[in-house]
């Protein structure tokens, strides 16, 4: 979290943003909240990029203000206009990419004074992954597939019943690159697996972990998934 | 406990169709794999078709493959054996069977239903 | 297609021998394989898989052994409800899922 303040005392006000991750080629969110002024017609505000020279986006006067947002922004922002006027100035940008990545400052200007915070802004790939039982192999195998991961991450197995096992001798992992030439396909094999167990595959890079287990019953196959966006520091 | 029912057998003539169906209860039918298999008067087992958990992926022996279709509705817990151009060769008693949880064989049985194919 | 090959076709057991069932697959199939038991009129009932794990409720009388191609079925002591006939199946490659042909266990 990080908390920012305006420069002189009185005109001063509090400016939060929370750094988050972007999942590229789909949107993202970059949060910033402050305290909020009873006029719209008086609220400003502006997002920065560290290192680029326009502006992210601009909202003043009630109304989006995009003459000096810079190129690589155009036609990809956008801020929650009805909830400015409760301190709401989070920015919504489409088709989040790699280069998206950086600082960003949340600067507001309101009848009560001025404030800025710093954001911190990750991106890359992240998806859910999904465990199931190979019945193509030939030795009792589960296999976990996460469609999108970037940077490359690591995949760890653990089991329910061998709790603090290394699996890796057991288990093979594959990074296949996808389409668009960045982001990769998980695919991770364990092999040997046994019966009345409870399995978890966990994928992690610098931005996200994800885990999906698979419990093995010969009365049920119970599939779960959930995904974790890592360093969501506020400020 | 697993309980499988099937049901839709009977005397048909050859070339017709007929369609199966199995009634599971007592586990998450969701999650298995689901097996046909047939048992011909006096002879031996004979595994027919499997379909996937999620029913996306369907296989069949090369006797019943183009004639034979294998479906689930999983919000009903039922398998299905739908049987196109039926020949005396597939006259038969049909178990539904569930695959076992990590590999195929098969841990629970139907009781079986007589599927006779004679003019 | 993997051809599971059982013998004998027929074996006669008094009440209380010991039964020892073969089964043979065309090529490896490591340790996937079943064994099954039917009764007259009824349907199979699983006994064994992964070559020796007995299935929920066997009892300890049935044990089965072998890995690769060679595979047997033991009755150890054979009681009056054990006279069936007696089914392998291999689940290392498919399609199709094999069976032997099956070993008729009478009383002699």
């Known amino acids: 979290l990080i908390i920012g303040f305006g420069i002189s005392g009185r005109h001063s006000i509090t400016v939060t943003t929370v750094a988050s991750a972007g999942n590229i080629g789909e949107d993202g969110i970059l949060s910033c909240t402050f305290e909020p002024d009873i006029k719209l017609s008086d609220i400003v505000i502006q997002w920065l990029k560290e290192g680029v020279l326009g502006l992210v986006h601009e909202f003043k006067e009630g109304k989006d203000e995009l003459s000096e947002q810079d190129e690589m922004f155009r036609g990809r922002t956008a801020v929650f206009a009805d909830q400015v006027i409760v301190g709401n100035a989070s920015l919504r940008l489409k088709n989040v990419q790699l280069t998206d990545a950086g600082t960003y400052k949340c600067y507001i200007i309101t009848s009560k004074g001025k404030g800025n915070a710093n954001l911190e802004y990750k991106t890359g790939a992240f998806s859910m992954p999904e465990v199931n039982v190979d019945y193509n192999a030939s030795s009792e195998t589960l296999r976990c597939e996460a469609p999108r991961w970037f940077p490359q991450p690591t995949v760890v197995w653990a089991s329910q019943v061998d709790q603090g096992a290394n699996f890796s001798e057991v288990s093979n992992t594959s990074f296949e690159l996808n389409s668009e030439n960045v982001t990769m396909k998980v695919v991770s094999v364990l092999y040997n697996v046994t019966i009345n167990n409870t399995y978890s595959c966990m994928i992690e890079n610098d931005i996200a972990k994800a885990t999906g287990d698979i419990k093995v019953t010969e009365s049920e196959i119970k599939r779960r998934s959930h995904l974790q966006l890592l360093n969501s520091k506020a400020s | 406990q697993v309980q499988l029912v099937e049901s839709g057998g009977g005397v048909v003539q050859p070339g017709r169709s007929l369609r199966l169906s199995c009634a599971a209860s007592g586990f998450t039918f969701r999650s298995f794999g689901m097996h046909w298999v047939r048992q011909a008067p006096g002879k031996g087992l004979e595994w027919v078709a499997v379909i996937s958990y999620e029913g996306s992926n369907e296989y069949y022996a090369d006797s019943v493959k183009g004639r034979f279709i294998i479906s689930r509705d999983n919000s009903k817990d039922t398998l299905y054996l739908q049987m196109n151009s039926l020949r005396a060769g597939d006259t038969a008693v049909y178990y539904c069977?569930?695959?076992?949880?990590?590999?195929?064989?098969?841990?629970?049985w139907g009781q079986g239903t007589l599927v006779t194919v004679s003019s | 297609e993997i051809v599971m090959t059982q013998s004998p076709a027929t074996l006669s057991v008094s009440p209380g021998e010991r039964a020892t069932l073969s089964c043979r697959a065309s090529q490896s199939i490591s340790s996937n394989l079943g064994w099954y038991q039917q009764k007259p009129g009824q349907a199979p009932r699983l006994l064994i898989y992964g070559a020796s794990t007995r299935a929920t409720g066997i009892p300890a009388r049935f044990s089965g052994s072998g890995s690769g191609t060679e595979f047997t079925l033991t009755i150890s002591s054979l009681q009056s409800e054990d006279f069936a006939v007696y089914y392998c199946q291999q689940y290392q490659s498919w399609p199709p899922l094999t069976f032997g042909g099956g070993t008729k266990v009478e009383i002699k």
């Open positions: 069977a569930k695959g076992g949880g990590l590999r195929w064989y098969f841990a629970y």
